[in-house]
């Protein structure tokens, strides 16, 4: 008789997940010497324990403390750069802008990256199936219980002058339910942060609005400005020049300090 | 070292044509996005025009826009601005120049610039 | 479309501190940059991003930017200082230079 398995609303596990974390841990610890010293065989085992065996709508911050600790790493506090809703062009821009750091260029933000992972109450199986979603399901989700986790310890991390990237092509440009909007702005300390600078990716040169009004950017600006954050927005209407220095790294216009 | 060197300026009647040529060395000229600038006698800096890296848009001050056309060859590394009828006001140094390639969006190197006179 | 507005003229003595400002609708809301401009010469940009010298521009040149006012600040101005300063925004579609400043050294 085939056991009966709950139906969650999300897709399920990405495909060879183990196969992928471990591989993906390798990879960055070679690329990078700071992190030489992690076992990855060690960081595997700590994710499978955060959510093997729980049910996946009970995850909770502490089952992903084992991993934290494991991926502890000092990323420069003042070269922060946080995103909402445009991941692809923060992350061109930080290969471009060396040292610059978005969450993903941390090794657990690494690992995670566009993967979803779940498991089973009382099984030690992965759930290749399907998966909570955040909405139709459960927001204690082994995914969102980890992005929540690390984003909060990533913006609580940051100083001096923090930039975030932010989409002004959608409806809301700043979104309070999204991880920035919910997380990261909440958990950036006053006593280390001076200034939140907002980078508003315009969808093209065409559009001259100056986005820096919107009301949901003066909303950010107040949730700031309360917490004795200095707020600053700047309007960035060429997005495709991240391209070009995609293309051309090397070039010193593209590797001048931010 | 970047360097951009104009030519095609010179005298040219009202209502005439000209156009200006602007040769890029000593960089990777199809990633850059391009412009050109004026200065007319004892006056300041105007923003004439600009060209996106693979020329695929172009952008007009508003008192050159249906005369003015620029274009580039990324082959020959050479930026074009095309000036048809030309007015007395349309008088000054135009210079090529170069848009910085990252977050900040501001023009990084010029070239020495090319005089047009129009004139009767 | 925004409007860029400088003063005509500042003077500074030697050694001095020179400001030069640049005044906008909200212009805090975009990255400004400044050029100098010698007689007979091109444009050289000596600040951009608001407040991000070049490689190659001293140390004494800064800039700052925010509310409608940007600011060029030459500390312990020099002879060779003496040049035309403009301002320069992009705005969407189009950049915006301001009308320029004359900078003289007395």
């Known amino acids: 008789v085939p056991r009966w398995r709950q139906q969650w609303s999300g897709p399920g596990t990405t495909k060879r997940f183990p196969e992928t974390v471990l591989a993906r841990c390798v990879k960055y610890t070679e690329i990078h010497p700071e992190m030489r010293h992690v076992d990855c065989q060690s960081v595997w085992d700590a994710f499978k324990g955060a959510f093997i065996s729980k049910h996946p709508c009970n995850i909770t911050e502490e089952d992903y403390q084992p991993l934290m600790k494991l991926g502890t790493q000092t990323v420069p506090c003042n070269k922060i750069l946080l995103w909402s809703r445009i991941k692809d062009l923060a992350h061109q821009f930080t290969q471009v802008q060396r040292d610059m750091f978005t969450l993903e260029d941390t090794l657990l933000g690494y690992l995670a990256d566009d993967l979803t992972w779940c498991g089973e109450f009382n099984t030690s199986k992965i759930n290749y199936q399907s998966c909570p979603d955040w909405r139709k399901d459960c927001s204690n989700n082994p995914v969102s219980v980890f992005w929540k986790t690390v984003s909060r310890r990533f913006a609580e991390a940051a100083c001096d002058v923090v930039h975030v990237m932010l989409n002004g092509s959608r409806s809301k440009i700043f979104d309070k339910n999204s991880t920035f909007g919910s997380v990261e702005v909440h958990n950036l300390q006053p006593e280390k942060v001076q200034t939140l600078e907002a980078w508003v990716i315009h969808g093209g040169r065409e559009d001259s609005r100056d986005l820096c009004q919107d009301p949901t950017i003066k909303e950010l600006e107040s949730i700031i400005s309360k917490r004795n954050i200095q707020f600053s927005c700047k309007n960035i209407y060429r997005p495709d020049k991240f391209l070009q220095c995609v293309k051309n790294p090397e070039d010193s216009s593209c590797t001048s300090e931010i | 070292q970047v360097q951009l060197v104009e030519s095609g300026g010179g005298l040219v009647q009202p209502g005439g044509s000209l156009r200006l040529s602007c040769a890029a060395s000593?960089?990777?000229?199809?990633?850059?996005?391009m412009s050109w600038v004026r200065q007319a006698p004892g006056k300041g800096l105007e923003w004439v025009s600009a060209?996106?890296?693979?020329?695929?848009?172009?952008y007009y001050a508003d008192s050159v826009k249906g005369r003015f056309t620029i274009s580039r060859d990324n082959s020959k590394n050479t930026l074009y601005l095309q000036m048809n009828s030309l007015r007395a006001e349309d008088t000054a140094v135009y210079y090529c120049a170069r848009y910085y390639s990252g977050i900040y969006q501001h023009i990084d190197y010029w070239g020495q610039g090319t005089l047009v006179t129009v004139s009767s | 479309d925004i409007e860029l507005t400088q003063p005509p003229s500042v003077s500074v003595a030697p050694g001095q501190t020179a400001r030069i400002s640049c005044s906008g609708d909200?212009?805090?809301?975009?990255?400004v940059s400044w050029y100098q401009q010698k007689p007979g010469q091109a444009p050289v940009l000596v600040i951009y991003?608001?407040?991000n010298r070049p490689s190659g521009i001293p140390e004494r040149f800064s800039g700052s930017n925010s509310g409608n006012t940007a600011t060029l600040t030459i500390s312990g101005t020099q002879a060779e200082d003496e040049a035309d300063y403009y301002c320069?925004?992009?705005?969407?579609?189009?950049?915006?230079f301001g009308g320029g400043t004359k900078l003289t050294v007395l």
């Open positions: 060209i996106r890296y693979d020329g695929s848009n172009t």
């Open positions: 320069a925004s992009d705005v969407g579609s189009l950049d915006v």
């Open positions: 000593g960089f990777t000229f199809s990633d850059y996005a």
């Open positions: 991003g608001d407040n």
């Open positions: 909200n212009i805090g809301h975009y990255y």
